[in-house]
Interface confidence: low
């Protein structure tokens, strides 16, 4: 009984961890699209899971690369 409980808890923990990167939970991953150049200056803001507004998806993606973070897109539009 105890072993089953521990197994279930572990499975739930794993599910919740993997859910953090899913599009249906916290948000979706920002894409850089073309890695050779910088981002355009087109203002089409996205709200990051860090609570900050980024001018476009590309900017958030490159910020992630620069800072070695994994901030997701919480929603389109400003936070």
């Amino acid at each position: 009984m105890k072993v089953t409980g521990i197994f279930l808890l572990s499975a739930l923990a794993l599910l919740s961890l993997s859910g953090n990167t899913g599009a249906d939970s916290l948000g979706r991953e920002a894409k850089c699209y073309n890695e050779l150049n910088g981002c355009t200056k087109i203002y089409d803001p996205v709200c990051g899971t860090d609570g900050n507004t980024y001018p476009n998806e590309c900017v958030l993606c490159f910020e992630n690369r620069k800072r070695q973070t994994s901030i997701l897109i919480q929603k389109s539009g400003p936070c």
């Epitope: 087109i42 203002y43 539009g77």
Partner: antibody, heavy 120, light 110 residues
């Protein structure tokens, strides 16, 4: 997938123009929509656009008298232009702006255009 | 401002020949450039995007090149159906723009 502009017509100087672009087959949450016009015998002129997020941006000449809005439920994007003059006589196009791809930004789907004539 | 200058304004080419149209940006726009073809009384048609990527369904006789401020559209093996006006458009900046399009180049096929 298509975009279609509402009917244009004859307007008087100082009138306000409102055009509607109806989109079908794709979501306004996934694509930007741009407005472009073309005066008779002239080239293409960018008016502005509304992004996936609902943020609007405008050409510098259009900023003071143009407003672009959208209704995601009705799948429509509207262009409102105030203080019309004869110089605003043109065919007005709406077009889908795929700006997701960043340097791949392009107007890949165009309406047939609608003629707006401003004359007293 | 990000201004686009197209040259020449008009060009005449024989069937089977090659035509080159240039587009210059006043500031660097990376490769965020598209080319369109427009025939009289018709809507513009996307030919090239990302400076060099061929749009779906477009003949490989059309090709684009360039980055930064200098761009080129080349039409090889010109056909009568290529008679049209061609426009470049920058997709790099939207907040400081008079016109995202170049002035156009009329291609006359003889």
């Amino acid at each position: 997938q298509s975009v279609k502009e509402s009917e244009g017509g004859l307007f008087k100087p100082t009138d306000t123009l409102t055009l509607t672009c109806t989109v079908s087959g794709f979501s306004l949450s996934s694509y930007a929509i741009s407005w472009v016009r073309q005066a008779p015998g002239n080239g293409l002129e960018w008016i502005g656009a509304i992004g996936k997020s609902g943020s609007a941006y405008y050409a510098s000449w259009a900023k003071s008298r143009s407003t672009i809005t959208r209704n995601t439920n009705l799948n429509t994007v509207s262009l409102k232009m105030t203080s019309l003059t004869a110089a605003d006589t043109a065919t007005y196009f709406c077009a889908r702006w795929d700006s997701v791809g960043w340097t791949d930004a392009r107007l890949d789907l165009w309406g047939q255009g609608t003629l707006v004539t401003v004359s007293s | 401002a990000y201004d686009m200058t197209q040259t020449p304004a008009s060009v005449e080419v024989a069937v089977g020949g090659t035509v080159t149209i240039k587009c210059q940006a006043s500031q660097s726009i990376s490769t965020a450039l598209a080319w369109y073809q427009q025939k009289p009384g018709q809507r513009p048609k996307l030919l090239i995007y990302g400076a060099s990527k061929l749009a779906s369904g477009v003949s490989s006789r059309f090709s684009g090149s360039g980055s930064g401020t200098e761009f080129t559209l080349t039409i090889s093996g010109v056909e009568c159906a290529d008679a049209a006006t061609y426009y470049c458009q920058q997709g790099y900046e939207t907040s400081n723009v008079d016109n995202a399009f170049g002035g156009g180049t009329e291609v006359v096929v003889k």
